[in-house]
């Protein structure tokens, strides 16, 4: 029986150009975590495997950093990064647990002010 629960950072927002940490935590189970996959919609961002270490998808290598822990750091955020992110925990013997995070990337305040005001 699967007794565990995934706690996530839930809905988060960050500024364009900045960075954000995506974090999930599996609790209430003694199951062993064998692998955590990080996905954005249907795209694989990264894998953290207990035996093999990290795999970062080559198309995200310049903007994704492993950690902290089983989490993932997204850098140089763009508005296109807005959307759902999933942490998929493979555990033994329980099976698979999935957590969801919604990230909204906002235009930075500097950019907003730059659009509204002209420097004389």
């Amino acid at each position: 029986m699967m007794t565990g629960t995934i706690e996530t950072t839930g809905n988060i927002s960050a500024e364009k150009g900045g960075s954000i940490i995506l974090q999930c935590h599996l609790s209430s189970t003694t199951a062993q975590v064998t692998q955590v996959n990080w996905e954005q919609q249907d795209q694989l961002l990264a894998i953290c495997n207990a035996d093999l270490g990290w795999h970062i998808s080559p198309s995200f290598k310049d903007r994704v950093a492993p950690g902290p822990g089983l989490g993932l750091t997204l850098q140089s955020l763009t508005v296109n990064d807005t959307g759902e992110y999933f942490c998929i925990y493979h555990t033994y013997p329980d099976g698979t647990y999935t957590g969801r995070i919604f990230l909204e990337v906002l235009e930075s305040s500097v950019a907003e002010h730059g659009a509204r005001f002209q420097i004389p």
Epitope: T34, Q35, I47, N49, D51, L52, G53, P58
Partner: antibody
Framework: EVQLVQSGAEVKKPGASVKVSCKAS????????MHWVRQAPGQGLEWMGR????????KYNEKFKTRVTMTVDTSTSTVYMELSSLRSEDTAVYYC????????????WGQGTLVTVSS | DIQMTQSPSSLSASVGDRVTITCRAS??????LAWYQQKPGKAPKLLIY???TLAEGVPSRFSGSGSGTDFTLTISSLQPEDFATYYC?????????FGGGTKVEIK
């Protein structure tokens, strides 16, 4: 076009070490981990370990942990695998293989390097 | 460690035949299975990863299926260039084990 070109065949005596090279081209070298896999004559495939050309971090098969060292030279896009304390059972073809984009499988392979251990 | 068992170890078939090779994992490996083709004196070539995703440039006559512990590689219509040895591999756990191989020979 992705290419992995390995060094030539080697003959070694028991107890010696061998260092095999694998030169990569046709892609961004630091974006993909590299693995080493060996195949004894007439036998199956055996994974030895992986190395990240970006951070030079590595992970080894427990079986080889005390005898294998994987290194990188980013200036020439080359990875190296050194195996020490050779014995006759290490006679095999050694392959470098690039890690795939979506996990720990191998999407491109070198042509292989035959290492013969014989007294 | 997880063990991968392929069957049969060899088979004889004719051009045009439908060929099925199976691979069994000793425990649940989800869909983390790859298939490779190897010809004598050559390096292996990736055919399929994640159990069913065809690698770039691989003909559509090759297909993969299965999840959990039981997996299948199917060649829908065997071609002369398909006579080779095929290996499965669990691609998400150390030591990234391969199956023992299945040699497809000409009948």
């Amino acid at each position: 076009e992705v290419q992995l070109v390995q060094s030539g065949a080697e003959v070694k005596k028991p107890g010696a070490s061998v260092k095999v090279s694998c030169k990569a081209s046709g892609y961004t070298f630091t974006n993909y981990w590299m693995h080493w896999v060996r195949q004894a004559p007439g036998q199956g495939l055996e994974w030895m370990g992986r190395i990240d050309p970006d951070s030079t971090g590595s992970k080894y098969n427990e079986k080889f942990k005390t005898r294998v060292t994987m290194t990188v030279d980013t200036s020439t896009s080359t990875v190296y695998m050194e195996l020490s304390s050779l014995r006759s059972e290490d006679t095999a073809v050694y392959y470098c293989a690039r890690e795939g984009a979506y996990g720990y499988y191998f999407d491109y392979w070198g042509q292989g390097t035959l290492v013969t251990v014989s007294s | 460690d997880i063990q991968m068992t392929q069957s049969p170890s060899s088979l004889s078939a004719s051009v045009g035949d439908r060929v099925t090779i199976t691979c069994r994992a000793s425990e649940n490996i989800y869909s983390y299975l790859a298939w490779y083709q190897q010809k004598p004196g050559k390096a292996p070539k990736l055919l399929i990863y994640n159990a069913r995703t065809l690698a770039e440039g691989v003909p559509s006559r090759f297909s993969g299926s299965g999840s959990g512990t039981d997996f299948t590689l199917t060649i829908s219509s065997l071609q002369p260039e398909d006579f080779a040895t095929y290996y499965c591999q669990y691609h998400s756990g150390s030591p990234l084990p391969f199956g023992g191989g299945t040699k497809v020979e000409i009948k």
